[in-house]
């Protein structure tokens, strides 16, 4: 989790002179707890935002806006923490807006925002704004949360960004598996523009089954600049075991942007649909 | 025209099932999370599932969960909910809804912010 470095932090509007700080996501008034505490945010939206930083690279940002209720307690409104915690790490990041003037009512709502989270493809946050000070530690809550699932980089929108292109969401290798005969699997994908080795990955699965019955890896090693773009072609043997027929064919690249962390992509082999007839019962039966 | 449009509600019995459709037209539906959302007579609005761009992720409400099931068609422009085990409670005008962004507001606290709606479909369970 970070913050995007394109321009300088700002929160001032008018009417309101503030500043953007960082924080430990402890604010002081859970230490020193204040009387008079403000209401808690109306109208909590997170969305997906794209942005660039100075150097042209574009990230997906987590655009934070909300609101304030319209009650007296805005008076006693000293600012904001924003918290982003990502969910599968427990790592989180704050933000403090610091209001360095007295919030006022005026004819329309007051309206914040904040877009300067960058956010990472497939995963999820919980975004939490809290109104400062804090309330006491028996008074009514003050701070409004949403989860928010960032897409993968397979969405067409994120597949431009630079952590997704970063990791070969670009290379669409079109892969196409078939099945020939003496148990053989002929495996054909379009190769990247890059001279980088790949790896099949060949699972195996019985019918209705997700425990695997075969797994098999084999290298591809770097084409050459002129076999960029091009189809390569790879027969992979199976093993000859009977119901081992569903099989999963998952292509790693190592592109030198991701190493061994690039995004693969996979193709499937069903099993042969089952006659719905009965085998018919032979005239005779063998005497041996 | 940016619109959504639901069908499929209807009376049935407790313990039955029932299917709902929404179309979507006028947006690039495939880029968006969907959502389902009940308002029970003289209730407010309560989320019942969620469904991220690809599928890859569903949310249900405790109220529905193991019983009702969201999907989506993105060649078709069509979200659905299954809904089995049908009780009384489940009485409800059903709306479909859309996320506003391209993320994926997940969980029951996101009704407040999607900003299309259908028209809703009323699904009456009762014996």
């Known amino acids: 989790l970070r913050l995007l470095d394109h321009r300088a932090l700002v929160c001032s509007q008018p009417g309101l002179n503030c500043t953007v700080k960082n924080s430990t996501c402890l604010d002081d008034s859970w230490i020193h707890p204040r009387n008079l505490t403000p209401s808690s945010p109306k109208d909590l939206q997170i969305q997906l935002h794209f942005a660039h930083t100075q150097q042209g690279d574009l990230f997906p940002v987590a655009h934070i806006e909300w609101t304030l209720q319209t009650d007296a307690s805005i008076l006693y409104l000293e600012g904001a923490e924003l918290s982003v915690l990502q969910l599968n790490t427990n790592e989180r990041l704050c933000v403090r807006f610091e209001f360095l003037s007295k919030l006022r009512h005026h004819h329309r709502r007051w309206r914040f925002t904040f877009s300067h989270f960058v956010v990472d493809p497939d995963q999820e946050y919980e975004v939490t704004v809290h109104h400062l000070p804090k309330p006491i530690p028996d008074g009514d809550p003050n701070h409004q949360s949403k989860n928010f699932l960032v897409p993968d980089c397979e969405h067409a929108r994120m597949k431009v960004t630079t952590p997704c292109m970063s990791s070969g969401s670009l290379w669409d290798p079109n892969i196409t598996v078939e099945t020939l005969e003496a148990h053989q699997l002929r495996v054909s994908f379009t190769l990247w523009n890059e001279s980088t080795h790949y790896q099949i990955l060949l699972t195996s699965f019985p019918h209705m089954e997700n425990h695997s019955c075969f797994e098999h890896m084999h290298h591809i090693p770097a084409p050459r600049p002129e076999e960029f773009h091009q189809r390569s072609n790879v027969t992979l043997t199976l093993r000859n075991l009977k119901g081992c027929c569903r099989h999963q064919v998952q292509i790693q690249p190592f592109f030198s942007s991701c190493l061994n962390d690039c995004l693969r992509h996979s193709a499937t082999v069903s099993c042969p649909e089952m006659p719905d007839t009965p085998e018919p019962i032979p005239d005779y039966m063998p005497l041996w | 025209e940016v619109q959504l449009v639901e069908s499929g509600g209807g009376l049935v019995q407790p313990g039955r099932s029932l299917r709902l459709s929404c179309a979507a037209s006028?947006?690039?539906?495939?880029?968006?999370?969907m959502h389902w959302v009940r308002q029970a007579p003289g209730k407010g609005l309560e989320w019942v599932s969620g469904?991220?761009?690809?599928?890859?992720?569903?949310d249900y409400a405790d109220s529905v969960k193991g019983r009702f099931t969201i999907s989506r068609d993105n060649a078709k422009n069509s979200l659905y909910l299954q809904m089995n085990s049908l009780r009384v409670e489940d009485t409800a005008l059903y709306y479909c809804?859309?996320?506003?962004?391209?993320?994926?507001?997940?969980?029951?606290?996101?009704?407040?912010?999607?900003?299309?709606w259908g028209q809703g479909t009323m699904v009456t369970v009762s014996s």
């Open positions: 469904i991220s761009w690809n599928s890859g992720r569903t």
């Open positions: 006028g947006f690039p539906f495939d880029d968006y999370a």
């Open positions: 809804a859309k996320d506003p962004s391209l993320g994926y507001c997940s969980g029951g606290s996101c009704s407040d912010v999607f900003d299309i």
